[in-house]
Interface confidence: medium
């Protein structure tokens, strides 16, 4: 619909509380080194305006379209070159450019300090002072680390920040009752973040067909007895809000994700018998719910695939017809039934039956080419069901903690390059999908653990963007979407690298180690090991393992002695010299 | 019972247009995605465009994509086709059918209406 204000417009359906909010998320998407309280000025700015056009919609300016209005406003900012450098030069362009060069200016890994966590009686206080303003400095902290976060949802993360809050600062033991729910929150939102993170990559690197291909997948794994032209329906929705989300249109985003709560819940009877629950639940709670939703039961007495796909006389007229639909169909019919299959694994499926037709229909005999086409499947599925065999194996005589060491060590020799930092939060993240993904029985494991690889990878591959170091890396990262994770795993030892001088400094470790979290004390250590493996990427596991042995017995007793720092300075230096000899350094 | 009666084609010059209507009774109409689908002399069927139950999305075969518009009302159970720059090879008979569950199978078809594109 054609609007005279669109600003108005949105205003009027958001409401001012949600209207402020997502507003204020986007400019610190967007500016995420500004101050707080410049923002906040900057928010207030364009409400006031914003409720000027809801007055009166002809009134001057209120036609703009909102990347005009809310970039003029980015651009009154004036210490924008001192602060961003080159981004001050996006003031100078025209929309759409404009609003183009400050999407590419977004920074995954922004050079900010870490959110330390304040005592509870310190929140608590803060909160009853000034809740609005404490709820509002959550949104801005989260936005200016997460730029690509999914706006809606992060309405529904403040939401339950605000819950937790209004019930613990009430409770006997607020502590007891906080922190466990702030934990909760804070790991639900790192995952949510890196989620939509790979839903941008895929729009943003691979385009509206790759997105649309992998919702087509997810959805009809979810809603197996939705129709097709129901399936499609959504999934041209879903993407139509993804892309707004993702472009920072996220007043536009948050409405269309609304709309689609609203026409998926007045329509559950032809979409899944599992979303009555979601159904009954306010708006910000019922679209995180029906994003989570589990499969529905599969209609009974599927017929087999092959009939259509493989034998029909018709196959090549059908996708000569409309490539795109026939092939949606073929990936709607695989994914309904199969929710066994991770979707990474459903695409690759679909891209050798697309691979297959493409070269078939062109030849003298198109059946006898294509016949046995699923036969080429087998060992597409068989080879992500090996490797979750193995590395669940592995996780479960390891521990989490030295499985994420095994991958550390694994990822290092692949791509030593990259840098500390990035191998060791991506290795940790790899690590998870142990327990996130082993308990599960064998038909819930390989959509939990693949589907759960392709989003930490991908993290590896826009940290790796920001500062490109390693060809295979890029290289993985940019050929094929769904092939990131064969890749990756295909990767042997780079035998082009040459090891990184041996630096004592890296290995010298002080007493403020003894106060860290058990948490930051394993990062503390893999920082180490990665360290290790770049110095001698030819060690052995034996080797590495004694060394690693050896480093935590010199931490424990060092944080045990009486005279921890110099128990540091004087058995660290003997460490050092012990794992030289141990490595051959 | 299911009925869907199909209207408005003709013999018309090429460059031409027409709009073909359907009109659709004994089942929920607006609950159902639906689709036109033409069949040339002497050739098997082809699907020409689809179109969801709410009105988006819309589908089109890759030879009528930009000259042929889907659209439906809902309020008075009918199907359209708006034809544009019509070509002799857009000579069929066009049929309006209920979209397939899942597979490409079609359950209700209506009676076909000519269209005959000649200078």
């Known amino acids: 619909d054609a609007h005279k204000s669109e600003v108005a417009h949105r205003f009027k359906d958001l409401g001012e509380e949600n209207f402020k909010a997502l507003v204020l998320i986007a400019f610190a998407q967007y500016l995420q080194q500004c101050p707080f309280e410049d923002h906040v000025k900057l928010v207030n700015e364009v409400t006031e305006f914003a409720k000027t056009c809801v007055a009166d919609e002809s009134a001057e300016n209120c036609d703009k379209s909102l990347h005009t209005l809310f970039g003029d406003k980015l651009c009154t900012v004036a210490t924008l070159r001192e602060t961003y450098g080159e981004m001050a030069d996006c003031c100078a362009k025209q929309e759409p450019e404009r609003n183009e060069c400050f999407l590419q200016h977004k920074d995954d890994n922004p050079n900010l300090p870490r959110l330390v966590r304040p005592e509870v009686d310190v929140m608590c206080t803060a909160f009853h002072d000034n809740e609005e303003t404490f709820l509002k400095k959550y949104l801005y902290e989260i936005a200016r680390r997460h730029p690509y976060f999914y706006a809606p949802e992060l309405l529904f993360f403040a939401k339950r920040y605000k819950a937790a809050f209004t019930e613990c600062c009430q409770a006997a033991d607020k502590a007891a009752c906080l922190l466990p729910k702030l934990d909760e929150l804070r790991d639900e939102g790192k995952a949510s973040s890196a989620k939509q993170r790979l839903k941008c990559a895929s729009l943003q690197k691979f385009g509206e067909r790759a997105f649309k291909a992998w919702a087509v997948a997810r959805l009809s794994q979810r809603f197996p007895k939705a129709e097709f032209a129901e399936v499609s329906k959504l999934v041209t929705d879903l993407t139509k809000v993804h892309t707004e989300c993702c472009h920072g249109d996220l007043l536009e985003c948050a409405d269309d994700r609304a709309d689609l709560a609203k026409y998926i819940c007045e329509n559950q009877d032809s979409i899944s018998s599992k979303l009555k629950e979601c159904c009954e639940k306010p708006l910000l709670e019922k679209s995180h719910c029906i994003a989570e939703v589990e499969n529905d039961e599969m209609p009974a007495d599927l017929p087999s695939l092959a009939a259509d796909f493989v034998e029909s006389k018709d196959v090549c007229k059908n996708y000569a017809e409309a490539k795109d639909v026939f092939l949606g169909m073929f990936l709607y019919e695989y994914a309904r039934r199969h929710p066994d299959y991770s979707v990474v694994l459903l695409l690759r499926l679909a891209k050798t039956y697309e691979t297959t037709l493409e070269k078939c229909c062109a030849a003298a005999d198109p059946h006898e080419c294509y016949a046995k086409v699923f036969d080429e499947f087998k060992p597409l599925v068989e080879e992500p069901q090996n490797l979750i065999k193995q590395n669940c194996e592995l996780f479960e005589q390891l521990g989490e903690y030295k499985f994420q060491n095994a991958l550390l060590v694994r990822y290092t020799k692949k791509v030593p390059q990259v840098s500390t930092p990035t191998l060791v939060e991506v290795s940790r993240n790899l690590g998870k999908v142990g327990s996130k993904c082993c308990k599960h029985p064998e038909a819930k494991r390989m959509p939990c653990a693949e589907d759960y690889l392709s989003v930490v990878l991908n993290q590896l591959c826009v940290l790796h963007e920001k500062t490109p170091v390693s060809d295979r890396v890029t290289k993985c990262c940019t050929e094929s979407l769904v092939n990131r994770r064969p890749c990756f795993s295909a990767l042997e030892v780079d035998e082009t690298y040459v090891p990184k001088e041996f630096n004592a400094e890296t290995f010298t470790f002080h007493a403020d180690i003894c106060t860290l979290s058990e948490k930051e004390r394993q990062i503390k250590k893999q920082t180490a090991l990665v360290e290790l493996v770049k110095h001698k990427p030819k060690a052995t596991k034996e080797q590495l393992k004694a060394v690693m042995d050896d480093f935590a017995a010199f931490v424990e007793k060092c944080c045990k002695a009486d005279d921890k720092e110099t128990c540091f300075a004087e058995e660290g230096k003997k460490l050092v010299a012990a794992s030289q000899a141990a490595l051959g350094l | 019972e299911v009925q869907l009666l199909e209207s408005g084609g003709g013999v018309v010059q090429p460059g031409g247009s027409l709009r073909l209507s359907c009109a659709a009774s004994?089942?929920?109409?607006?609950?159902?995605?639906m689709l036109w689908v033409r069949q040339a002399p002497g050739k098997g069927l082809e699907w020409v465009s689809v179109i969801h139950q709410s009105g988006t999305p819309t589908y089109y075969a890759d030879s009528v994509k930009g000259r042929f518009t889907i659209s439906r009302d809902n309020s008075k159970n009918t199907l359209y086709l708006q034809m544009n720059s019509l070509r002799a090879e857009d000579t069929a008979v066009y049929y309006c059918a209920k979209f397939p569950s899942s597979r490409m199978k079609f359950d209700y078809w209506g009676q076909g209406t000519l269209v005959t594109v000649q200078s």
């Open positions: 004994g089942f929920t109409f607006d609950t159902s995605s």
